[in-house]
């Protein structure tokens, strides 16, 4: 691993997941141990990231269970590498009007997708809903994530080094606590609420507006419960 | 190889429900959504619903809201979807297809369901 | 709801022939556009995602083009197992599909 690591100083209060949506449904952006990458329909372990903002729009996203980086090729295609190359690994974040968030390789200009197509990023473009993501709190208990917290006084330092390679064990100071509206989720279908027979809000209009809350990569805004 | 499997020919009487299964195998079950198509004789495809295989969460088009009932059984790898009240314009052949974000890829071989008195 | 129109409903062509296939949707759509071909008792086969990339294992006589609103399939030489049945759909909002374009033999 760098050691000048983009994840130093992160904690697991940070993890979020980043997500495609239609009225229909969504897809979890997850990094395998493997480093393929593809989408699950619901939060996984291996869609947990650590998403770290660079200067200019730039950010850098690893998959905490995969202890691997998000990169692309100069094919367009992503990938999970325990490498980190700044050209390939480094993405341009830009908030789109309707509030979802696109990401492209600055080196190779492709968007960040779910889809099997690569394209290009234009400004002014309107990618197709899986180049489109939001990003949404972690709601898997850590307990999940089978990886063993440094118990004090038991592990040396070095230990601890090589169980938590990118230091996302730490403890650090909390992040400020996301705003409600970040979990807030719609009613379900067994509710008995006006909403029930149209959870997903489809009836008033396709994409959900995520104007409101709009943080950036590391916040999260309001989201509908795609099923 | 990826395959899903769909239940026998079934007629129903008007009024009645019916509900027809597909077995999904060749692949991780949970990790695609499945949706339900159908197609009346001699007319085009007409998406129903869509159903989450992991929390069995669903949504359905406006047109079949109340009728149509989509479930999942992880344990065998098998999506189910029920139609009630049922009427002559329902006898179509109904599809099962596997959602890969951008397509539905793989498709069931189909239902056909005949609702005649 | 995104409304998809195909034209034409129907066409009749001769194997060799180029037939082009268009599908109009309500509102802009991206790529977010697949194409199906369905013959007669079978289930639907994906040609075409994206609006523009072939599924494999589609022959390469298969294309599509377009973004936003309109689009086009296109056969660049019309053979014997290309009579049936073409369907758009889009992955925009929802799922819908358009009517479905008829080729058969002239």
């Known amino acids: 691993y760098p050691n000048a690591s983009p994840l130093l100083g992160s904690s697991w209060g940070g993890l979020i997941h980043l997500y495609t949506a239609t009225a229909r449904n969504s897809y979890h952006l997850q990094i395998h141990k493997n480093g393929h990458v593809d989408g699950a329909p619901h939060q996984t372990i291996y869609s947990a990231l650590m998403i770290r903002s660079e200067d200019a729009g730039f950010v850098v996203i690893t998959g905490v269970m995969s202890r691997r980086y998000l990169c692309m090729d100069f094919r367009g295609n992503i990938f999970g590498s325990h490498y980190f190359d700044p050209e390939n690994c480094r993405f341009q974040h830009q908030t789109l009007e309707n509030g979802y968030d696109v990401y492209h390789s600055p080196q190779y200009h492709f968007l960040v997708s779910l889809g099997r197509a690569k394209r290009a990023f234009l400004p002014g473009m309107n990618p197709p809903p899986y180049s489109q993501f939001l990003s949404r709190r972690n709601e898997i208990p850590l307990i999940h994530f089978n990886t063993p917290i440094p118990r004090r006084h038991t592990q040396s330092a070095e230990d601890d080094s090589e169980r938590d390679p990118l230091n996302v064990l730490k403890p650090r100071a909390r992040m400020t606590p996301a705003p409600a509206s970040c979990s807030q989720e719609l009613p379900s279908a067994e509710d008995n609420s006006p909403m029930a027979s149209d959870p997903l809000g489809v009836v008033r209009g396709g994409r959900v507006n995520t104007h409101a809350g709009g943080t950036g990569p590391e916040g999260c805004r309001p989201f509908a419960k795609f099923i | 190889q990826v395959q899903l499997v769909q239940s026998g020919a079934e007629v129903k009487k008007p009024g009645a429900s019916v509900k027809v299964s597909c077995k999904a195998s060749g692949y991780t079950f949970t990790n695609h959504y499945m949706h339900w198509v159908r197609q009346a004789p001699g007319q085009g495809l007409e998406w129903m619903g869509i159903i989450n295989p992991i929390s069995g969460s669903t949504s359905n088009a406006q047109k079949f809201q109340g009728r149509v009932t989509m479930t999942r059984d992880t344990s065998t790898s098998t999506v189910y979807m029920e139609l009630s009240s049922l009427r002559s314009e329902d006898t179509a052949v109904y599809y099962c297809?596997?959602?890969?974000?951008?397509?539905?890829?793989?498709w069931g071989q189909g239902t056909m369901v005949t609702v005649s008195s | 709801a995104i409304q998809l129109t195909q034209s034409p409903s129907s066409l009749s062509a001769s194997v060799g022939d180029r037939v082009t296939i268009t599908c109009r949707a309500s509102?802009?759509?991206?790529?977010?556009l697949v194409w199906y071909q369905q013959k007669p008792g079978k289930a639907p086969k994906l040609l075409i995602y994206d609006a523009s990339s072939l599924e494999s294992g589609v022959p390469s006589r298969f294309s599509g083009s377009g973004s936003g609103t309109d689009f086009t399939l296109t056969i660049s030489s019309l053979q014997p197992e290309d009579f049936a049945t073409y369907y758009c759909q889009q992955f925009n909002d929802e799922f819908t599909f358009g009517p479905g374009t008829k080729v058969d033999i002239k």
């Open positions: 297809a596997r959602d890969i974000v951008d397509a539905f890829d793989f």
């Open positions: 509102q802009g759509i991206s790529s977010a």
